[in-house]
Amino acid sequence: SEAKVTRSCAETRQVLGARGYSLNLIPPALISGEHLRVCPQEYTCCSSETEQRLIRETEATFRGLVEDSGSFLVHTLAARHRKFDEFFLEMLSVAQHSLTQLFSHSYGRLYAQHALIFNGLFSRLRDFYGESGEGLDDTLADFWAQLLERVFPLLHPQYSFPPDYLLCLSRLASSTDGSLQPFGDSPRRLRLQITRTLVAARAFVQGLETGRNVVSEALKVPVSEGCSQALMRLIGCPLCRGVPSLMPCQGFCLNVVRGCLSSRGLEPDWGNYLDGLLILADKLQGPFSFELTAESIGVKISEGLMYLQENSAKVSAQVFQECGPPDPVPARNRRAPPPREEAGRLWSMVTEEERPTTAAGTNLHRLVWELRERLARMRGFWARLSLTVCGDSRMAADASLEAAPCWTGAGRGRYLPPVVGGSPAEQVNNPELKVDASGPDVPTRRRRLQLRAATARMKTAALGHDLDGQDADEDASGSGGGQQYADDWMAGAVAPPARPPRPPYPPRRDGSGGKGGGGSARYNQGRSRSG
């Protein structure tokens, strides 16, 4: 079969000339190849300099293909992170706006005078969500204490409440024994709902961000000496041999690429990470609904105020007993009691059937649906990466042309060595390059740990807890559906059975870089748009 290999370098000169190589360095006909370091030391079209340059180019081609194949992962996770982050922040703004409108309408001037407390609450909720704030328990306890300090004196305009009295009042209100519950059960219910939801939202957007960062790092593949030489033998040496149109055999490519990627894969942590995102997303549009939580902040605060008003005699008696009787205000200094409606009339929020929609015209329901569609394309990406790379026309002959002769590494023919799997155990027997059998390299281990940490955080948040120490699951009943998700988790939101893989496609790119990605199989990873 070797006799069929051309003795001319015309094809090679044409290909390399088009790539900007000096034709002075490429002989018109094959020369002796004793000077070659990587390619077979037979007849060749390559000088030492050409071989060295081709080694660098083949590395770059491989690196570029890996990055292109995974670019859709990076773009999708980045776009989803941006959309969810914008959505959550906008929902907090919508909640603040509707609280302002409703309280202005219900409490009039009273609200206007004390709006800073409410604005402060939302500011601290945003800080917590954005990871810069203190714990939610403290934030909410402070809010209710401040509210009590402002509202309690309004219930008793005949008394004077100096700062030290108000300090006693707020200490009493926030004491852990719960002896004084001026706002009834509203603070506890608001804390549970807000904590579960914000912890889940924060874990979710952090999870998307971690995934994006991990993937973009993992796609920057360092090429070892052994991998570099194998890549050269795979796609560089046919040029040196004078047969640039002879494509490498598919099995040869798979062995080389799997060897080069052997310590880089993120499975099974990748699949678990995707499951974590999906389960937590489900929680955020179901039992931990961010929209309902945002809507209900005003309702819960209003309920607390109504409780205080309706139980003011009992609450006041407790306060006066613990903090002492307040001093009466001299008659001439006494303010007229506020009009009845300003002291707070019963107010209930109008419930809308339609889910809240942001200015961008989206809602969480739609965002979660879109997320599922896009994550479905990501499943199995790392496991299939070698097939995707070898599906590119620069890397190997079309897998469907199995019977046709191809470049074996030595010449034209059929590739006879066994094609090994991608696991470290199988890679020990890789015929094309020596692979370290000790498993993932250090950077990959670190990345897998990052994915595991993000997954653990999402798993914990999906069960109503905060990995950073806050426990949001005081009453496990929540708004229903709790245990089902725990079971889903244990089962691991399993992917449906795999379809036969389709032949991988070369990466596609558009100007924005938002599309692209490698080949795919139905029910597996595929090309995807960033959005």
Epitope: D282, Q285, G286, H365, R366, V368, W369, E370, R372, E373, R374, L375, A376, R377, G481, Q484, Y485, D488, A491, A493, V494, A495, P496, Y505, K515, S520, R522, Y523, G526, R527, S528, R529
Partner: antibody, heavy 119, light 107 residues
């Protein structure tokens, strides 16, 4: 393999509620990652997606029908159902149930059931 | 909603002809597009998924291509059993929408 079968009355009076059930055999309706969907086709016309229910219970409806549609699942019977209220003659169609996986087509489909709205 | 416009709405071709149907989306849907075949009195049958991938068991004379907003469905050599109505369907965004269909007949 998985099979779907629609059932329900073939004739419904205007202003009443159309109720259909899809029975799933050869697989569990509570398997994760699946959407259970309803699609309809008026006589001689094209296909219209009505809505889907995800295995976790989230529902997704076509905005053009949203105010009248309810899709629910009964895991104990391995069935899911469609209710369409206040029907008119324009709701006369062949109603199909189908399964869908995130990121993938409707597959398989039921064979369809014709529902006529007439007094 | 994303509108899917199929053309032509009907066409007549001879056995062995190459037949092409186009589908245009009102906005970019990447390759989130499927093609179905529906014969009279039957449920639709999936032929092509993700714009260009042949469903298992579907004859290789059927193919699909395109990305973004413009998609093409091709039958390389028309056979008598291909008489049917063909639909494209997008799932990039809610609501899921179908093209209005292309009715294919034999001359």
């Amino acid at each position: 393999q998985l099979q779907l079968q629609e059932s329900g009355p073939g004739l419904v009076k205007p202003s009443e509620t159309l109720s259909l059930t899809c029975t799933v055999s050869g697989g569990s309706i509570s398997s994760s990652s699946y959407y259970w969907s309803w699609i309809r086709q008026p006589p001689g016309k094209g296909l219209e997606w009505i809505g889907s229910i995800y295995y976790s219970g989230s529902t997704y409806y076509n905005p053009s029908l949203k105010s009248r549609v309810t899709i629910s699942v009964d895991t104990s019977k391995n069935q899911f159902s469609l209710k369409l209220s206040s029907v008119t003659a324009a709701d006369t169609a062949v109603y199909y149930c189908a399964r869908r996986v995130s990121g993938h087509p409707f597959d398989p489909w039921g064979q369809g059931t014709l529902v006529t709205v007439s007094s | 909603d994303i509108q899917m416009t199929q053309s032509p709405s009907s066409l007549s071709a001879s056995i062995g002809d190459r037949v092409t149907i186009t589908c245009q989306a009102s906005q970019d849907i990447s390759d989130y597009l499927n093609w179905y075949q529906q014969k009279p009195g039957k449920a639709p049958k999936l032929l092509i998924y993700d714009a260009s991938n042949l469903e298992t068991g579907v004859p290789s004379r059927f193919s699909g291509s395109g990305s973004g907003t413009d998609f093409t469905f091709t039958i390389s050599s028309l056979q008598p059993e291909d008489v049917a109505t063909y639909y494209c369907q997008q799932y990039d965004n809610l609501p899921i929408t179908f093209g209005q269909g292309t009715k294919l007949e034999i001359k």
